[in-house]
Interface confidence: low
């Protein structure tokens, strides 16, 4: 049995290619180390977008990933993915692993469908 991970089913990226969504897990165990992985599902394949480990001392994550950011508070992670383009439209899953204290605990959300619409190019101007 795994923990329950919830995330919104649909999110629309901003015109700047930024999508933000929460990833929550329950029950809210008193956990000192939580690993969060964002995966993108395309057909039957799952690819890792970014991953980070949150601790009570490190509540800002994804420092190794310029296009991902996130903050952790108790049993909720607020995720932001930047630099998205129309081709990045797809299902993004949030995987949560409770690393410490043991026993190890893992759960996966049902995924957030992120829609990305490339901004219209500015029309040429005579000015």
């Amino acid at each position: 049995e795994a923990i329950q991970v919830t995330q919104p089913s649909v999110v629309l990226a901003s015109s700047h290619g930024v999508a933000s969504f929460p990833c929550e897990y329950s029950p809210s165990h008193n956990t000192d180390e939580v690993r969060v992985t964002v995966l993108r599902q395309t057909n039957d394949q799952m690819t890792e977008v970014c991953a980070t480990t949150f601790t009570e001392k490190n509540t800002v994550g994804f420092l190794d990933y310029p296009f991902c950011s996130g903050t952790f508070n108790e049993s909720r992670v607020n995720l932001t993915i930047q630099g998205l383009r129309a081709v990045d439209t797809g299902l993004y899953l949030c995987k949560v692993e409770l690393m410490y204290p043991p026993p190890y605990f893992v759960g996966m959300g049902n995924g957030t469908q992120i829609y990305v619409i490339d901004p219209e190019p500015c029309p040429d101007s005579d000015f």
Epitope: E1, A2, P27, T55, E56, K57, M99, Y100, P102, F105
Partner: antibody, heavy 117, light 112 residues
Framework: EAKLQESGPVLVKPGASVKMSCKAS????????MNWVKQSHGKSLEWIGV????????SYNQKFKGKATLTVDKSSSTAYMELNSLTSEDSAVYYC??????????WGQGTLVTVSS | DIVMTQTTLSLPVSLGDQASISCRSS???????????LEWYLQKPGQSPKLLIY???NRFSGVPDRFSGSGSGTDFTLKISRVEAEDLGVYYC?????????FGGGTKLEIK
């Protein structure tokens, strides 16, 4: 107020098994890990193992694998530890203790197990 | 297994004095997540142990501020600034960083 109530003392014969209980109250039982600790007479403490009451996952001290089995009953908010093939070495006080930022933030009163023929 | 050593088995003190109890681990008990899970417990005769300090220096709720913990790596100390009669008992250090988690042998604080 969080409370752990353990079962009473038991006298068992060598080779037998014993199952002791730890009833939790005053908090959400499934939200916190439950540990078991052994204290032989006049001796120090030994960590036996820990169970996740939410899903029953366990982590044991290798020394007690095969000796101790940890289980929970979520409906009654009770943790159990069964000890098998008892010998005089198993005579001790056994404590349940709940994780809360620290491994043993709250303790039961202990269950005295005496193994004697 | 990590061995937690409390070299002082018995520590006689006068009430009102400062007491210092040491604990040494056989290897570093810094967890991979950066935390050091070193805890201190007090067990009075006929009672269950009680948590005093967790993560080296954090006092548990209700623990008087005369108790303080310090240390890093492998060497740790519990200090009681002014010993009171209710502080007498056996003090155990414990590491919860690496399985199997282990306790020290205990230091008995008694009246001189």
């Amino acid at each position: 107020e969080a409370k752990l109530q353990e079962s009473g003392p038991v006298l068992v014969k060598p080779g037998a098994s014993v199952k002791m209980s730890c009833k939790a109250s005053g908090y959400t039982f499934t939200d916190y890990y439950m540990n078991w600790v052994k204290q032989s007479h006049g001796k120090s403490l030994e960590w036996i193992g820990v169970i996740n009451p939410y899903n029953g996952d366990t982590s044991y001290n290798q020394k007690f694998k095969g000796k101790a089995t940890l289980t929970v009953d979520k409906s009654s908010s009770t943790a159990y530890m069964e000890l098998n093939s008892l010998t005089s070495e198993d005579s001790a006080v056994y404590y349940c203790a709940r994780y809360y930022g620290s491994w043993f933030a709250y303790w039961g009163q202990g269950t005295l197990v005496t193994v004697s023929s | 297994d990590i061995v937690m050593t409390q070299t002082t088995l018995s520590l006689p003190v006068s009430l009102g004095d400062q007491a210092s109890i040491s604990c040494r681990s056989s290897q570093s008990i810094v967890h991979s997540n950066g935390n050091t899970y070193l805890e201190w417990y007090l067990q009075k005769p006929g009672q269950s142990p009680k948590l005093l300090i967790y993560k080296v220096s954090n006092r548990f709720s209700g623990v008087p501020d005369r108790f303080s913990g310090s240390g890093s790596g492998t060497d740790f100390t519990l200090k009681i600034s002014r010993v009171e009669a209710e502080d007498l008992g056996v003090y155990y250090c414990f590491q919860g960083s690496h399985v199997p988690y282990t306790f020290g042998g205990g230091t008995k604080l008694e009246i001189k």
